[in-house]
């Protein structure tokens, strides 16, 4: 079970929203806090530690889910071409 | 099967650009991210650099880095290297490579192309 | 870089294991690829167990604590050529960057 703790969103800059959100789950033995259909989950650590992030389907349905080269996150882009970039901190 | 055909080799001069192409076939190209590695006359595997599926992010190796832009062609299935400010140590075959799954490392790649030699020299 | 040795014989039917070792711990696993003269590498081992399914099931990958092995339990002929290692290499300046060992020349008598 998980809960959003905070979430900030940032408009200023054109074309581009910044959010930031925390999320609090209680969570099984061997998992741990993720995202899964764009919205808090518990997930296997095993994806956390290797950074395997599109392992967690953490897309919308329909999306399709790209790992950053550098693993620092993923990004979910959608039928009509949209990138959603999210960064894990 | 999977088929990658790369072209654009061949004798290329000193301080000069090349444009290399990686023609896919087989699979859903959008779906994988790609990557160059190159191999010098008589030398083992060097890694060259990836792309992700949309091609908005790429890395590269240190080797290339500055002089090397990776791209690809979704509706044509189609991925490209570009590199300037050739040197004869970028003498070597490029191979096109696919990653297995939704990420490619030097551990995942599960196809690779023919390879197509580039010579740098005057 | 990784390390693996340069060569290893062996007699037709008998099980081969080349070893590799370094790179960073990505969660990626390791990869093995097989390249004769003149062709290019071809993937028998990728993500430390995974087999194309056009190579033989006498390929295997496994993962010991740092040590990679790639075994060949019954070489063929065929089977001789040199064997890279792949796997990741992390540093501050480039981020994760793949790395490859320098070759494994298996010879098969």
């Known amino acids: 079970t998980c809960e959003i703790v905070t979430l900030d969103r940032d408009s200023s800059q054109p074309r581009r929203t910044i959010a930031r959100q925390t999320a609090r789950c209680a969570c099984r033995k061997g998992q741990i806090a993720g995202t899964t259909r764009a919205r808090p989950a518990c997930v296997d650590a095993r994806i956390i530690k290797t950074k395997q992030w599109c392992d967690m389907l953490p897309c919308l349905e329909g999306e399709g889910c790209d790992l950053l080269i550098n693993r620092s996150g993923w990004t979910c882009t959608q039928p009509g071409g949209r990138i959603k970039t999210t960064t894990v901190s | 099967a999977v088929t990658l055909d790369e072209s654009g080799g061949g004798l290329q001069t000193p301080g000069g650009a090349l444009s290399l192409s990686c023609k896919a076939s087989?699979?859903?190209?959008?779906?994988?991210?790609m990557g160059w590695v190159r191999q010098a006359p008589g030398k083992g595997l060097e890694w060259v650099g990836v792309i992700n599926k949309s091609g908005s992010d790429t890395s590269y190796g240190s080797a290339v880095k500055g002089r090397a832009t990776i791209s690809r062609d979704n509706g044509q299935s189609t991925l490209y290297l570009q590199m300037n400010n050739l040197r004869a140590e970028d003498t070597a075959v490029y191979f096109c490579?696919?990653?297995?799954?939704?990420?490619?490392?030097?551990?995942?790649?599960?196809?690779w192309g023919h390879g197509t030699e580039v010579i740098v020299s005057s | 870089a990784l390390t693996q040795p340069s060569s290893v014989s062996a007699n037709p039917g008998e099980t081969v294991r080349i070893t590799c070792s370094g790179g960073?711990?990505?969660?990626?696993?390791y990869g093995w690829y097989q390249q004769k003269p003149s062709s290019a590498p071809l993937t028998v081992i990728y993500?430390?167990?995974e087999r194309p399914s056009d190579i033989p099931s006498r390929f295997s990958g496994s993962s010991s604590g740092s040590t990679h092995t790639l075994t060949i339990t019954g070489v063929q002929a065929e089977d001789e050529a040199v064997y890279f290692c792949?796997?990741?290499?992390?540093?501050?300046?480039?981020?994760?960057?793949?790395?490859f060992g320098a070759g494994t020349t298996l010879t098969v008598l």
């Open positions: 792949g796997n990741d290499d992390y540093s501050s300046d480039s981020g994760y960057v793949g790395v």
């Open positions: 960073a711990s990505s969660g990626y696993g």
């Open positions: 087989g699979f859903t190209f959008s779906s994988y991210q």
């Open positions: 490579a696919k990653g297995s799954a939704s990420y490619i490392t030097a551990a995942t790649i599960d196809a």
């Open positions: 993500k430390d167990d």
